[in-house]
């Protein structure tokens, strides 16, 4: 099991890996994740994460999805998954292709959330949801 201890410099360290995440960020597999409690549109969420030196989370493994679902408090969180309408394909914001399934698809739902269900859910990009930011652990 991971052992976390709070240091005085605003970072959370994991003794098992010697890696560091900022205060209030969660560590998983050499990455740091921030789950916001405030809500905003997808565009604002993207800018919010960018302002923290991170991106919206790219949840590209089942293990990462399970880890995040376990800590999402049954709320909807925007992630870095967007619909390429002309291509008719979902891609992560790093442009890698998404090979899974997105539920709740709708002509006007070009963004995606996780958290409330066990799946990736299509969502309106303009509605305000919480967001998950991701960056490398130091």
């Amino acid at each position: 099991p991971q052992i976390f201890n709070k240091s005085n410099d605003g970072f959370t360290t994991t003794r098992s890996y010697g890696t560091v995440c900022p205060k209030d960020w969660e560590f998983y597999q050499a990455r740091c994740f921030f789950l916001s409690t405030s809500e905003s549109s997808w565009n604002e969420s993207r800018d919010f994460c960018k302002g923290k030196g991170s991106t919206l989370a790219i949840v590209n493994t089942p293990e990462k999805l399970k880890f995040l679902q376990d800590i999402t408090d049954a709320e909807k969180y925007f992630i870095g998954l967007i619909y390429h309408r002309e291509e008719k394909r979902w891609r992560w914001i790093n442009n890698s292709v998404f090979n899974g399934n997105v539920t709740n698809q709708n002509q006007n739902f070009n963004c995606a959330t996780i958290g409330l269900t066990k799946t990736f859910d299509a969502a309106s990009c303009d509605i305000s949801y919480r967001r998950i930011c991701e960056k490398n652990a130091k």
């Epitope: 997808w42 991106t55 394909r89 992560w92 914001i93 442009n95 890698s96 292709v97």
Partner: antibody
Framework: QQQLEESGGGLVKPGGTLTLTCTAS?????????MCWVRQAPGKGLELIAC????????WYATWVNGRFTISRSTSLNTVDLKMTSLTAADTATYFC?????????????????WGPGTLVTVSS | DIVMTQTPASVEAGVGGTVTIKCQAS??????LAWYQQKAGQRPKLLIY???TLASGVPSRFKGSGSGTEYTLTISGVQPDDAATYYC??????????????FGGGTEVVVK
Amino acid sequence: QQQLEESGGGLVKPGGTLTLTCTASGFSFSSSYYMCWVRQAPGKGLELIACIYSSSGRTWYATWVNGRFTISRSTSLNTVDLKMTSLTAADTATYFCARSYAGYGGYGYAYFNLWGPGTLVTVSS
Amino acid sequence: DIVMTQTPASVEAGVGGTVTIKCQASEDIYSSLAWYQQKAGQRPKLLIYDASTLASGVPSRFKGSGSGTEYTLTISGVQPDDAATYYCQNYYDSTGSGYGAAFGGGTEVVVK
């Protein structure tokens, strides 16, 4: 049929300015596309210059551009322009217009699935 | 920036033979890779995207494979019409904020 056609190429003196135009037909700029300019010097490889998101006008430039080139678009005319200033012999190349799919809000892109035939720019005194 | 290293620069093949072109990325690009064919004096043509998906209308003798940092384009049963220069292109964006697509240096395929 979806097509791209470049125009505006030709001979220009060093230090001069030239504007290239890419005219798109068969699809609308109100959709989610990145429109880009790619160049190819004689006998050399492909080099990405700049891109613009068709619907919002959000732009991206290669780091080496250093403000010499400006990309813009007209949604009413379905055109993309590349204004090139302070041209040197090293800018001599065939300039291609290329289109990529884009994600919501222009926050994603992919491969180039549509290319124009290219227009030749020669910088020489 | 991610650097794409393409090898070899040139390769010769007989009709009916097999050509293998490699493209190496300076970091993991998660299969965000396309291959293009460019014949002399013509525009590039998309062959393969997402490392292995054949573009519409492209013959099945073209095959893309690979993952991580190593990618390969294989042309089986080479035809005279395959004489061209082939380019790989990365479109992975590790920052999620820019364009940053990079092309490999190209491989010239000469058909004997």
